[in-house]
């Protein structure tokens, strides 16, 4: 007898793990044999869908490899034309071990800003997310919170927040850990100790001290009156993210000195500045001929003659000392082109060292005059003819310019290195060379002869003077 379909085993909720098999059973009694169809969320499951297997005349639906998207309500409908169709429904709950779908990444953040370390998860039951910092579970506080999404939010990031983090997703089926990421907290450069202003006497040594901190550790640069410091020595040390810079200066003019601490945050820089003034106290007496300052020789004419990086005296009685003194040597230098090969190097050495006098520290940065012995060596040995001719022209008034008078020293007014070797400058080009002694011409003098000390002979010249030389 025909019999309307009856579902004898209604569908039940099925729990399945991802990638496992899930089976719904829909046992039907009827005659004739019913047609059984299956739907998921009211959408017909096609018989030829390879993800499913339908067996036992349609009474068994098997999902061959469960995906999380298979979640939903599955219904079977039986119909054999006798009576109405019957339906039974059941849910598929896809159970899933925790999975971290958006793991945290390394973060560099500036102190005081908000940091968010992402940690998006999947899983069923819904995983709970916690965080580990270093080796310990992270405790939430007023600045730190784990968001609904699982991400970690840190307000007003502080240096102590820096470290290694990982998120942990956990449900009844298991636990997932993210890889360890680094939170780096960068701190804007900040000056801890600003340089102090000084009021000093001309020629004093002053040390300006500047201490700064930041992450990364800042670099310190010094600026003098708006330009990079050209002289002075800088000593730096770094300890516990603090950089300490000391600028030692030989004070020959007042200045504004600025300490600039800089560090880099990605493509941007942060800087902190502090300035100090160095002023020069009034002297009790005028400086007379010593008005000027010491600086590295930056000219061209005397490059080969003066020692490399030599500090020379620049006379501020000229508006532009460097230019004026360079012009002075340049003018005289051109006239030396006509003198004898014996005289020329000696005269050039005398000229350059007379116009750009060597600087000496001690009292103040004063020019050291050329030693009398060297002046006389040029005058009476190397350039005797030329010197006479020049003095003659000067007496006859053929030299209208004061240039020549300024560029030729008066030997008798120069100190002797015999009486004080630190009172005057030597001309290395004329130093005594034991291998190639040349005797000075005899000189009439009531004073005893004086030894020129054996100084290292200069490789840049073959000139030498005899160790015995009369003084005037």
């Amino acid at each position: 007898l025909p019999k309307a379909p009856v579902i004898t085993t209604p569908l039940e909720t099925v729990d399945a793990l991802v990638e496992e098999v899930a089976t719904f059973m829909c046992a039907v009694e009827s005659y004739p044999q019913p047609e059984i169809s299956w739907t998921r969320n009211k959408i017909l499951i096609k018989l030829f869908d390879t993800r499913y297997s339908i067996r036992e005349n349609g009474q068994l639906l098997t999902i061959l490899s469960v995906e999380d998207s298979d979640d939903g309500i599955y219904c079977c409908t039986a119909n054999n034309g006798v009576g109405g169709a019957v339906e039974s429904c059941g849910a598929l709950q896809v159970k899933m071990k925790p999975k971290i779908t958006r793991p945290p990444i390394n973060v560099k953040i500036i102190e005081g800003l908000k940091a968010v370390l992402p940690c998006t998860t999947m899983g069923n039951p819904k995983p709970s997310v916690s965080w580990i910092k270093g080796d310990s579970p992270l405790r939430e506080n007023s600045r730190t919170a784990v968001l609904e999404s699982g991400s970690l939010r840190i307000h007003n990031v502080q240096k102590e927040d820096a470290g290694q983090y990982r998120c942990v997703a956990k449900n009844s089926l298991g636990t997932a850990y993210s890889k360890v990421v680094k939170l780096e907290v960068e701190v804007f450069a900040r000056i801890l100790r600003a340089p102090e202003s000084h009021n000093v006497t001309f020629g004093s040594f002053v040390t300006l001290h500047c201490t700064a901190t930041g992450i990364p550790v800042p670099t310190i640069t010094w600026i003098e009156n708006g330009n990079a410091v050209s002289s002075g020595s800088i000593q730096e040390s770094v300890k516990d993210r603090v950089i300490d810079s000391r600028l030692q200066l030989f004070i020959t003019k007042p200045g504004l000195y600025t300490c600039i601490a800089t560090n880099k945050h990605g493509e941007k820089f942060s800087t902190a500045k502090a300035a100090a003034t160095v002023s020069i106290a009034e002297w009790s007496k005028p400086q007379k001929d010593n008005k000027g300052y010491c600086a590295q020789y930056r000219g061209e004419v005397c490059n080969a003659v003066l020692a490399k990086d030599a500090l020379v005296f620049l006379n501020t009685s000229y508006a532009d000392p460097e230019e004026a003194q360079e012009l002075l040597v340049h003018t005289a230098w051109n006239e030396l082109k006509v003198v004898s090969p014996l005289c020329r190097p000696a005269a050039e050495a005398l000229l350059c060292n007379h116009v750009f006098q060597e600087c000496s520290p001690g009292v103040v940065p004063t020019p050291i005059p050329i030693c009398r012995e060297y002046c006389l060596a040029v005058k009476e040995l190397f350039c005797a003819k030329e010197w006479l001719a020049m003095e003659e022209k000067t007496h006859r008034g053929l030299y209208r310019s004061e240039m020549h008078l300024l560029s030729v020293p008066e030997c008798s007014k120069l100190p002797s290195m015999h009486w004080d070797p630190t009172a005057c400058a030597r001309l290395p080009h004329l130093d005594y060379n034991k291998e190639n002694p040349k005797t000075f011409p005899p000189m009439t003098s009531s004073k005893p002869s004086v030894d020129i000390p054996n100084l290292p002979s200069s490789s840049s010249s073959s000139f030498s003077v005899s160790p015995t030389y009369s003084m005037t």
Epitope: T207, F250, D289, A307, A310, L311, P361, G362, V363, T422
Partner: antibody, heavy 115, light 111 residues
Framework: EVQLVESGGGLVQPGGSLSLSCVAS????????MNWVRQAPGKGLEWLSV???????YYADSVKGRFTISRDNVKNTLYLQLNNLKPEDTALYYC?????????WGQGTQVTVSS | EIVLTQSPSSVTASAGEKVTINCKSS??????????LAWYQQRPGQSPRLLIY???TRESGVPDRFSGSGSTTDFTLTISSFQPEDVAVYYC?????????FGSGTRLEIK
């Protein structure tokens, strides 16, 4: 030969004054820096003052405001005026030629400050 | 001011022995490629005498057994072969900045 001969030392009471002189010979005095250095009995050397070729003077802090250095290039003489003397100023006072090194020394003159 | 620390404070040596005296400056005395440090000898009852200037240049008339070395802040006076006439107190002095300062001295005695 360089000669530096100091004079003017003696016994003086605390608060008193003295004027030391140093006559230089054998070199062109005006072209050189001159110094005063002292040595207390059984003690080390103490630099006091220097005067440059333009008569600009510099002093150690211990004597600043009390001692005055000066020179007379015509007389080839270096001076040190000592005022407001203290017992700790008792020493042998040397006149010394030299710019940054102290090259030639006199024999010294003794200053004793005692009541 | 620059402080010069001399060591040792005294040393006893035999004739022919090598003697070294050290002088450490509280800051660099190097300026314009010269070290402004000098060494002096003061024999008993005599005025001091300059031995070495610019750290290593021997003053004329000083025996070549005396030599100076060092740079920036650390300096040494060496007597290569000590002689009885070298019994004295030795001082270092900086001429780098006023006030010029001396070390406290090293007394050199004969064994």
């Amino acid at each position: 030969e360089v000669q530096l001969v100091e004079s003017g030392g003696g016994l003086v009471q605390p608060g008193g004054s003295l004027s030391l002189s140093c006559v230089a010979s054998g070199f062109t005095f005006s072209l050189y820096y001159m110094n005063w250095v002292r040595q207390a009995p059984g003690k080390g050397l103490e630099w006091l003052s220097v005067i440059d070729t333009h008569s600009i003077a510099y002093y150690a802090d211990s004597v600043k405001g009390r001692f005055t250095i000066s020179r007379d290039n015509v007389k080839n003489t270096l001076y040190l005026q000592l005022n407001n003397l203290k017992p700790e100023d008792t020493a042998l006072y040397y006149c010394v030629l030299g710019r940054t090194a102290l090259v030639r020394w006199g024999q010294g003159t003794q200053v004793t400050v005692s009541s | 001011e620059i402080v010069l620390t001399q060591s040792p404070s005294s040393v006893t040596a035999s004739a022919g022995e090598k003697v070294t005296i050290n002088c450490k400056s509280s800051q660099s005395v190097l300026y314009n490629q010269k070290n402004y440090l000098a060494w002096y000898q003061q024999r008993p009852g005599q005025s001091p005498r300059l031995l070495i200037y610019w750290a290593s240049t021997r003053e004329s008339g000083v025996p070549d057994r005396f030599s100076g070395s060092g740079s920036t802040t650390d300096f040494t006076l060496t007597i290569s072969s000590f002689q009885p006439e070298d019994v004295a107190v030795y001082y270092c002095q900086q001429g780098y900045s006023v006030p010029y300062t001396f070390g406290s001295g090293t007394r050199l005695e004969i064994k």
